[in-house]
Amino acid sequence: APVPPGEDSKDVAAPHRQPLTSSERIDKQIRYILDGISALRKETCNKSNMCESSKEALAENNLNLPKMAEKDGCFQSGFNEETCLVKIITGLLEFEVYLEYLQNRFESSEEQARAVQMSTKVLIQFLQKKAKNLDAITTPDPTTNASLLTKLQAQNQWLQDMTTHLILRSFKEFLQSSLRALRQM
């Protein structure tokens, strides 16, 4: 199983090292999740030809996956630390149902899928400690999530493959934009 950040042998062998700051821990956690996504994408791309499909073709889907927009304050123009942090946390909370869907979608990378899901939960906790305005963060409705999950799991095989690919790609892009913004904070 993948080793969570901070628990690899290098860390054990270097007890004299300075403990990670909150920002460094978040940075490391996101890179760890990105590594996990990369492994999952490899399996997905080996299994189907979804990865060759053009972005335009894939855009025609009914998934409401979180995406960074100018108004979210995470890009250089209109950068706003607090607005951006709220968007990152809200987006990660919205991704959780899609990460649940990914469980059981992988044969050789089942543990990796679980690691991505659990590491994201930890990341959300790290970020919530960093946020000042927790009231602005809206948590997805569990009933809505449950029915969405049921609907996604009822799709035919081709659509399930497409959904898996889109979730991984969108989650990767969201994390990349999030980390780029967090590195400015």
């Epitope: 990105l34 960074m68 250089q76 590195r183 400015q184």
Partner: nanobody, 124 residues
């Protein structure tokens, strides 16, 4: 890691323009965040600009904003830095850098591959 090769440096008068180019032969170029840094004699390496893998997330240092433009052509495995209204203080060795996580950022430690650098000299 990817091999990065910069070109397009040279000597130019203040107010002039130059275009730097950075090319790689790496197959996975499109998944990297790419950046330009610069280093003047006796100074630390300084962030200039970076660009995400989809060209939709671009950041500039305040000192170059409005004068420099970073862009990428994934089909040609190339990133460009168009430098206009050059000033003597832009004189430095310009380095191309790549981040395999596709994130980027303003610190050199975020990048795992570096080019050899291209000298840019702006005379007054």
């Amino acid at each position: 890691q990817v091999q990065l090769v910069e070109s397009g440096g040279g000597l130019v008068q203040a107010g002039g323009s130059l275009r730097l180019s950075c090319t790689t032969s790496g197959r996975t170029f499109s998944s990297y965040a790419m950046a330009w840094f610069r280093q003047a004699p006796g100074k630390d390496r300084e962030f200039v600009a970076d660009i995400g893998e989809n060209s939709d997330n671009i950041w500039y240092a305040d000192s170059v904003k409005g004068r420099f433009t970073i862009s990428r052509d994934n089909a040609k495995n190339t990133i460009l830095l168009q430098m206009n209204s050059l000033k003597p203080e832009d004189t430095a060795v310009y380095y191309c850098a790549a981040d395999s996580y596709g994130v980027g950022g303003g610190k050199p430690e975020y990048y795992d591959s570096w080019g050899q650098g291209a000298q840019v000299t702006v005379s007054s």
